[in-house]
C-alpha cells in the first residue's frame, strides 16, 4: 500500500530574468527513492537517479541546474516558463508518487508589487 505523500512548494511566482527553486519532499513512507523525474508539462527537464546522479535534458542545460537535494533550480526565467511542473518520485517498493507545482513568471515590477501584499 502506498502511504507516502508529496509536499511541494505549491503555487509560486517569480520575476522574469530571475531564478526559482522547485522543491518536492516525499514523506510518510519508508520506501526507497530510486529516481526523481522533473517534467514541465510534456517535456522531460531532468532526472536524478540514486545510482547515476543527475541528467539534465540538453535543451535545458543552459537554464536548469540540479539541486538543492532532489530539487531543481530554474534560471534566467522567461514568461514562457509559466506553467505546471511535476516531480515524479520512483520508489521501491511503493511505486510512483507525483507532485505538482504551478509557476507564474511575472514582469519584474508586477512580481515586486505582488510581494508587498503577501500574507506571511
Amino acid at each position: 500500500m502506498m502511504t507516502g505523500t508529496i509536499e511541494t512548494t505549491g503555487n509560486i511566482s517569480a520575476e522574469k530574468g530571475g531564478s526559482i527553486i522547485l522543491q518536492c519532499h516525499l514523506s510518510s513512507t519508508t520506501a526507497q527513492v530510486t529516481q526523481v523525474n522533473w517534467e514541465q508539462q510534456d517535456q522531460l527537464l531532468a532526472i536524478c537517479n540514486a545510482d547515476l546522479g543527475w541528467h539534465i535534458s540538453p535543451s535545458f542545460k543552459d537554464r536548469v541546474a540540479p539541486g538543492p537535494g532532489l530539487g531543481l533550480t530554474l534560471q534566467s526565467l522567461t514568461v514562457n516558463d509559466t506553467g505546471e511542473y511535476f516531480c515524479i518520485y520512483h520508489t521501491y517498493p511503493d511505486g510512483t508518487y507525483t507532485g505538482r507545482i504551478f509557476l507564474e513568471v511575472l514582469e519584474s515590477s508586477v512580481a515586486e508589487h505582488g510581494a508587498r501584499f503577501q500574507i506571511p
Partner: antibody, heavy 118, light 107 residues
C-alpha cells in the same frame, strides 16, 4: 568501452528451456537498469523484460509472463534470462540492453539467436 | 498497453533528401519517446532520446520533435549510410513498446 555480450542461444524443442546470459563490461553494471529485447526473423523489435539496477524490481511483457525470469548478478556483471515452456513464437534474436535512467536504451549487445523448433 | 503507430512503413528517398518519419502514441507519453536506427544483421543504435535529445556521437542531421502523442524524426539531408530501418519506442510505462518500423530505401 561499453560492451554487452550475450550467450546461451541455440536450437531448442517446444516446451524446452534455455538460459541466456549477458556479460557486461566497461561500465559500472550495478548502477544501470538492464532489459531484454527480442526480434523475430524479419520482424520488428519487441521488449521482453527489464530489471532495476539492484535487481529488486522486474517487469515482463504479457507474452512471456510466467514463463521467463530475468535476474542479475552484480558481483559477476552478468544479466540473465531464464526461458521456460518455450514456444515457436519465441524464436528470435535476443538482445540485452543498458537502460540509463530507465528511459532510453543507449547500448545493445550483438544479440543471440534462439530457435524453437521440433 | 500503449500502442505506437509509425508511418510510413517504408519510403524511398535519394541522397540529400529531407526525410520525415512520424510516430503516434495511443495515449500521452509526455516526452518519453526514443528513436533507433537498425541496419540488417546489426543491433539497433540510439539516435534520439526523450523526444528531442541527440545521443552523443549521432550526426546533427538527425533531429526529433514532439510531445504528448505525436512525434517526428527528421533527417535533414539523407546520407548513404542512413539507409536503414528506424524504430520509435515509448518508455513512459511498461510494457515498453516499439513502433512497427520504417524502412528507408534508396530511390
Amino acid at each position: 568501452e561499453v560492451q554487452l555480450l550475450e550467450s546461451g542461444g541455440g536450437l531448442v524443442q517446444p516446451g524446452g528451456s534455455l538460459r541466456l546470459s549477458c556479460a557486461a563490461s566497461g561500465f559500472t553494471f550495478s548502477s544501470y537498469a538492464m532489459h531484454w529485447v527480442r526480434q523475430a526473423p524479419g520482424k520488428g523489435l519487441e521488449w521482453v523484460s527489464g530489471i532495476s539496477s539492484n535487481g529488486g524490481s522486474t517487469s515482463y511483457a504479457d507474452s512471456v509472463k510466467g514463463r521467463f525470469t530475468i535476474s542479475r548478478d552484480n558481483s559477476k556483471n552478468t544479466l540473465y534470462l531464464q526461458m521456460n515452456s518455450l514456444r515457436a513464437e519465441d524464436t528470435a534474436v535476443y538482445y540485452c540492453a543498458r537502460v540509463p535512467y530507465g528511459v532510453w536504451i543507449d547500448y545493445w549487445g550483438q544479440g543471440t539467436l534462439v530457435t524453437v523448433s521440433s | 498497453d500503449i500502442q505506437m503507430t509509425q508511418s510510413p512503413s517504408s519510403l524511398s528517398a535519394s541522397v540529400g533528401d529531407r526525410v520525415t518519419i512520424t510516430c503516434r502514441a495511443s495515449q500521452s507519453i509526455s516526452s518519453y519517446l526514443n528513436w533507433y536506427q537498425q541496419k540488417p544483421g546489426k543491433a539497433p543504435k540510439l539516435l534520439i532520446y526523450a523526444a528531442s535529445s541527440l545521443q552523443s556521437g549521432v550526426p546533427s542531421r538527425f533531429s526529433g520533435s514532439g510531445s504528448g502523442t505525436d512525434f517526428t524524426l527528421t533527417i535533414s539531408s539523407l546520407q548513404p549510410e542512413d539507409f536503414a530501418t528506424y524504430y520509435c519506442q515509448q518508455s513512459y510505462s511498461t510494457p515498453l513498446t516499439f513502433g512497427g518500423g520504417t524502412k528507408v530505401e534508396i530511390k
